[in-house]
Amino acid sequence: FTITAPKDLYVVEYGSNVTMECRFPVEQKLDLLALVVYWEKEDKEVIQFVEGEEDLKPQHSSFRGRAFLPKDQLLKGNAVLQITDVKLQDAGVYCCMISYGGADYKRITLKVNAPYRKINQRISMDPATSEHELMCQAEGYPEAEVIWTNSDHQSLSGETTVTTSQTEEKLLNVTSVLRVNATANDVFHCTFWRVHSGENHTAELIIPELPVPRLPHNRTH
């Protein structure tokens, strides 16, 4: 008795849904009462299917209402784990364990990304020095580098700080500040670049015509 996992790595976006598969041999009609299916993530019980039905009692609270084992797929010899509204904490190694006559298991890795799509920006000016302070801030995962460029695509040196956001999701809050002497209508870009995936998102900042007063430092995003 051998089970197969068509894919052993799934990479999905935070907030999306994922469907992970383990296939097992079924001859003729599946006897649901003889089938045992476990999906586990490390020491957390995700799905337990025993004696023809899902047992939700041992299911870990973090998966409650989000993890499903479609019965119609089971009948085809496919133990599918569906997780909705994927969280960062769902990332890790899952194990599907199936007993049907014999027993076997396969491991599957889930990676979760949160792109730095929504980039907040702010431009302020220090009246004493006429130096502009450009700020870009975004949340995502995993860590991103922030690259500043001017309209000639030349790299500029900004100062980036990374904190863990106080949301339940523990996304990374990446803020980068560039101090630069600039004139009205000068264009700058901040790019949030996730090193490992190569994915990037860019915002354009244009120095306004009118001087912008420096905002207080105790601002929140």
Epitope: D8, Y38, E42, E45, A103, T109
Partner: antibody, heavy 116, light 107 residues
Framework: EVQLLESGGGLVQPGGSLRLSCAAS????????MSWVRQAPGKGLEWVSS????????VYADSVKGRFTISRDNSKNTLYLQMNSLRAEDTAVYYC?????????WGQGTLVTVSS | DIQMTQSPSSLSASVGDRVTITCRAS??????LNWYQQKPGKAPKLLIY???SLQSGVPSRFSGSGSGTDFTLTISSLQPEDFATYYC?????????FGGGTKVEIK
Amino acid sequence: EVQLLESGGGLVQPGGSLRLSCAASGFTFSSYAMSWVRQAPGKGLEWVSSIWRNGIVTVYADSVKGRFTISRDNSKNTLYLQMNSLRAEDTAVYYCAKWSAAFDYWGQGTLVTVSS
Amino acid sequence: DIQMTQSPSSLSASVGDRVTITCRASQSISSYLNWYQQKPGKAPKLLIYAASSLQSGVPSRFSGSGSGTDFTLTISSLQPEDFATYYCQQDNGYPSTFGGGTKVEIK
């Protein structure tokens, strides 16, 4: 601190029986699959048997299938291995191991010697 | 069954040496390979799981790499307490199988 303590090993004649026990502490025993792994004198490691967390499913190496029975009592935090029809080639140190992403914790082992 | 082949079966090295042990699976096991250290008369101890993840409490001089069928355990700077036998193990289906072991001895 995770602790696994095997007992029940000893000298037994070919064809005889032994029951090994493994007392677990320091973790939620019922949340993990458990296994037995053995090591013949001067040899490498050989997986023997595994039991899933609630005891419903048991799996065995071909070399012991039909002769050994793994079981667990989650209320007593104890893993068992009933060994029947023992053979000389079953002589080994038997380890119980907690199974998660790997055999992450092992007991100190108990020696089973099958000899006439 | 998936066969695990370790090489070399033994090696001699000095304190401070960089040591590399390889493990080959007879078919792809993705990255689900573990490494253990065993000293004489003692139980095995988990060093690396999932090919490259360092088990808690294990010194950072130990590292693992590889995926598919070929894997490596590296000890960056051998210490006196590292002289032992090392085993790889595939952990992606029954029966769970171990390599034959690599004994690291003092030169």
